[in-house]
């Protein structure tokens, strides 16, 4: 593949990454799949600066990010280390709340209306953000 040097149409460039902001809702797994099909991943927040950038674009709207604990420990979808990385949870979150009565707890993380994070039921149809790095190799064949 070739290195991606500019963002696709309708994506926003910021700090050598490209971001796409949905305007509809999907369950976390469907959002995750959508990003993968775009040769991207659900957004991985690695700094307060990136947090502010994403928050500015999504507004006060519950929005999925690429963080989940469906297999036990919290993990970022691109392998970024969770324990040592940036975190911005709401107070007393994540709480893996079972009291909703839907079966199971809460395994997927989203930005809340104030930007801080919450864990929630993964089937909820929230908006989502895809991210891809400009310097990574694209899956598309090089132009001849």
């Amino acid at each position: 593949g070739s290195e991606r040097t500019c963002c696709p149409v309708n994506w926003v460039e910021h700090e050598r990454s490209c971001y796409w902001f949905s305007r509809s809702g999907k369950a976390w797994a469907d959002a995750d799949n959508y990003c993968r099909l775009e040769d991207a991943h659900l957004v991985v927040v690695t700094s307060w600066e990136e947090q502010k950038f994403v928050q500015h674009h999504i507004g006060p709207v519950n929005t999925w990010m690429g963080l989940h604990d469906q297999n036990g420990p919290w993990k970022w979808v691109d392998g970024t280390d969770y324990e040592t990385g940036f975190k911005n949870w709401r107070p007393e979150q994540p709480d893996d709340w079972y009291g909703h009565g839907l079966g199971g707890g809460e395994d997927c993380a989203h930005f809340t209306d104030d930007g801080r994070w919450n864990d929630d039921v993964c089937q909820r149809p929230y908006r989502w953000v895809c991210e891809t790095e400009l310097d990574k190799a694209s899956q598309e064949p090089p132009l001849l």
Epitope: R23, V61, N62, L102, N118, P125
Partner: antibody
Framework: QVQLQESGPGLVNPSQTLSLTCAVS??????????WSWIRQHPGKGLEWIGY???????YYNPSLKSRVTISVDTSKNQFSLKLTSVTAADTAVYYC???????????????WGQGTLVTVSS | QSVLTQPPSASGTPGQRVTISCSGS????????VNWYQQLPGTAPKLLIY???HRPSGVPDRFSGSKSGTSASLAISGLQSEDEADYYC???????????FGGGTKLTVL
Amino acid sequence: QVQLQESGPGLVNPSQTLSLTCAVSGGSISSGYYHWSWIRQHPGKGLEWIGYIYYSGSTYYNPSLKSRVTISVDTSKNQFSLKLTSVTAADTAVYYCARDWGGYDSSGWFDPWGQGTLVTVSS
Amino acid sequence: QSVLTQPPSASGTPGQRVTISCSGSSSNIGSYAVNWYQQLPGTAPKLLIYSNNHRPSGVPDRFSGSKSGTSASLAISGLQSEDEADYYCEAWDDSLNGPVFGGGTKLTVL
């Protein structure tokens, strides 16, 4: 456990305004995680979504009722309300309030529901 | 006329397996998750299946949901007399820009 309870007059005169309130207990309406919906069921018929409101006041309405419907929220009383103007006999139905597990601009699923209140439009 | 189409009635004997269908289009079931509700006589609807195939706590595993293309179905195995009720499917619809319901299926346990 969140519970919802509808209240309001069971009889409304034609051409008047139907007004109902849904009281939410066991959880805060302003948590920011849910929509709050009104749904109705005509006697012996299926279910029809009327509209929903977010705690911030953002509303979505069924296009077929939009010109006559207003849904409002009172976070201080932990309740939301429905107003339907210019009612006719065709608005006779059981009216339910429900919590909607949707996102900002899409519906999720409705759970729980209030027990429903029958509103008859007749003079 | 409901946007989602369900058979008006279905029946079965105790212990049997019954399936209720829900047909839609690309603007609803084809693009969004389907939910199912059970309405026992004289009561409010109750969430039975959410997001195509997920059961809330307390719903027996005799109830299951599935979705394929623009159709969804609710299966009830080991039918019991207390399953006699109306069943409604529901999904978001892009044309309406809101949720739509099926017309309901009245299930009779013979």
